[in-house]
Interface confidence: medium
């Protein structure tokens, strides 16, 4: 019968011929009366056999990631008779893995959106690298993920590639972050290869800013001839949030005379001071009113940012009109 062990050949061997093993018949007494032959894909080009001894050699550099095993056939012939000594047999040469492939992130580019002020531990995104090396061969394809850029705001779970928030972020200070993740094979041991990817993390807005008046004091004038409903001027607050989180409502906080009103222009986010009652210069020639501004939509959990509404003082001078 045929005698052989499992055949392995390391990939990427640079030698011109690499001895893999021996294939022989147990009838072979070593007197060179048998001839060994190799057949199948790769026979003669990639692998050769010593016809006398049955020793098999790899004569080409192999790449496991291209082809990980070869199925060949062996024959042994009695030189004197030309007849097969053993039935033709199929055998396998496995290409063993070396760590010659770095991890690659295949789903690039990565982009994620996460609400600002999200608590520590919030999941942002999972990045996954793949390594073409053999996952069953040692640690060649066992990956560890680490953060090259993004501290202290982000962290990555070493074995899963899950990116989490590690420190609260304020969109109004910075609205996007570039995080660089490295994947290293060999679980980080010497000889490890690495690959990196960038993740663009954008912060979505939450209503964590209340509107604040641009001025602590506004000065307006109104003619005593102005009819009720007259717009006598505008006031303006600013809100560092965006979109509906920056929509605001103006109102009167204090007007003992009940002479004025404030309406909100929701397109410009301005407050319009309106004359509610006609004024008379001879009766009262100036007024002071206090206005306040609040956001239109504030979720309950964000009320802590909106405890005290911003206020402003409006000085309103009545202009005298000569009476006939």
């Amino acid at each position: 019968g045929w005698v052989w062990n499992q055949f392995f050949v390391p990939e990427e061997m640079n030698t011109t011929s690499h001895h893999i093993g021996q294939l022989r018949s147990d009838l072979d007494n070593g007197n060179n009366s048998f001839q060994y032959k190799l057949l199948g894909a790769g026979a003669g080009s990639t692998f050769i056999i010593d016809e006398r001894t049955g020793d098999i050699y790899a004569i080409q550099k192999l790449d496991r990631e291209e082809r990980s095993l070869y199925i060949l056939r062996a024959q042994v012939i009695d030189i004197a008779t030309g007849r097969a000594v053993e039935p033709e047999s199929e055998f396998v040469i496995k290409v063993s893995d070396i760590n010659d492939n770095e991890p690659k992130f295949l789903d690039e580019p990565y982009e994620a959106i996460v609400p600002e002020m999200s608590p520590e531990g919030t999941l942002v995104i999972q990045v996954t690298a793949s390594d073409a090396d053999d996952p069953s061969s040692g640690n060649n394809a066992r990956l560890l993920y680490s953060l090259l850029q993004g501290q202290p705001y982000f962290s990555v779970e070493p074995t899963t590639g899950v990116i989490r928030i590690s420190s609260k972020m304020d969109r109004e200070l910075q609205d996007e972050y570039w995080v660089i993740i490295q994947a290293k094979d060999m679980i980080g041991q010497p000889g490890a290869l690495s690959g990196t990817t960038s993740v663009l993390i954008k912060l979505s807005d939450v209503n964590d800013n209340k509107p604040i008046f641009k001025e602590s004091l506004y000065r307006l004038t109104v003619s005593e001839s102005a009819p009720t409903g007259t717009s006598i001027g505008t006031i303006m607050a600013y809100d560092n949030d965006i979109g509906e989180n920056a929509e605001m409502d103006y109102s009167i906080e204090e007007d003992d005379s009940q002479t004025f009103d404030i309406i909100t222009n929701h397109e410009t986010q301005e407050g319009i001071v309106i004359l509610k009652k006609k004024v008379d210069f001879e009766h009262q020639n100036h007024y002071g009113i206090r206005a306040k501004v609040k956001n239109h939509h504030v979720p309950e959990q964000l009320m802590k940012y909106h405890t005290e509404a911003s206020t402003t003082f409006i000085k309103i001078q009545v202009e005298d009109v000569d009476e006939p």
């Epitope: 602590s216 004091l217 000065r219 004038t221 204090e254 003992d256 005379s257 009766h283 009262q284 020639n285 100036h286 007024y287 002071g288 003082f313 000085k315 001078q317």
Partner: antibody
Framework: QVQLVESGGGVVQPGGSLRLSCAAS????????MDWVRQAPGKGLEWVAV????????YYADSVRGRFTISRDNSKNTLFLQMNSLRVEDTAVYYC????????????WGQGTLVTVSS | EIVLTQSPGTLSLSPGERATLSCRAS???????LAWYQQKPGQAPRLLIY???SRATGIPDRFSGSGSGTDFTLTISRLEPEDFAVYYC????????FGQGTKVEIK
């Protein structure tokens, strides 16, 4: 420090003119409305005139309207009161005063300058 | 114009006593628009109270203001030697007018 200093007072004949100045320092002069208030000898206080922070509006007491002109130079942090057609009853210590941001009361006063109108 | 009448014209008290000064307006004054000032001889007035009851910065808490409508009061809970002066009320709801003053003198 934060202060107002008046100057320009003196003795003038009835019908004469005088220009008072008030130099401001230690605060953002151009942000405040400014007023002149006077006090006749042994009497109470009387408001005279106001000018808005940017000079856009000016208002006067009936007793001085048409004779006095209030003005300001924000680049020099100075308030002025031009007094024409002076009368004996204009004799007083003239104070410049700063209006607060939130009302028309006066939170800062100068030491005053005396104007005497006498023949 | 709104006329403010202060009473009494003179108040003679000793240090440590309580002083109550009155200011009456000829027509209703919004409480937001009444102030009190202190003036010592040869000095400019000094703001004590605004908005009828709010103490100005740096004013000791022995000074307090109250009132609404046409009647307002300045109270000095315990007179200190430096409190003897003339006190003026001022309304600033319609133009600017001052009361004629109340002199607080040492008895």
């Amino acid at each position: 420090q934060v202060q107002l200093v008046e100057s320009g007072g003196g003795v003038v004949q009835p019908g004469g003119s005088l220009r008072l100045s008030c130099a401001a320092s230690g605060f953002s002069f151009s942000s405040y409305d400014m007023d002149w208030v006077r006090q006749a000898p042994g009497k109470g206080l009387e408001w005279v005139a106001v000018i808005w922070y940017d000079g856009s509006n000016k208002y006067y007491a009936d007793s001085v309207r048409g004779r006095f002109t209030i003005s300001r130079d924000n680049s020099k942090n100075t308030l002025f009161l031009q007094m024409n057609s002076l009368r004996v009853e204009d004799t007083a210590v003239y104070y410049c005063a700063r209006e607060t941001g939130e009302g028309w009361y006066f939170d800062l006063w100068g030491q005053g300058t005396l104007v005497t109108v006498s023949s | 114009e709104i006329v403010l009448t202060q009473s009494p014209g003179t108040l003679s008290l000793s240090p440590g006593e309580r002083a109550t000064l009155s200011c009456r307006a000829s027509q209703s004054v919004s409480s937001s628009y009444l102030a009190w000032y202190q003036q010592k001889p040869g000095q400019a007035p000094r703001l004590l109270i605004y908005g009828a009851s709010s103490r100005a910065t740096g004013i000791p808490d022995r000074f307090s203001g109250s009132g609404s409508g046409t009647d307002f009061t300045l109270t000095i809970s315990r007179l200190e030697p430096e409190d003897f002066a003339v006190y003026y009320c001022q309304q600033y709801g319609s133009s600017w007018t001052f009361g004629q003053g109340t002199k607080v003198e040492i008895k």
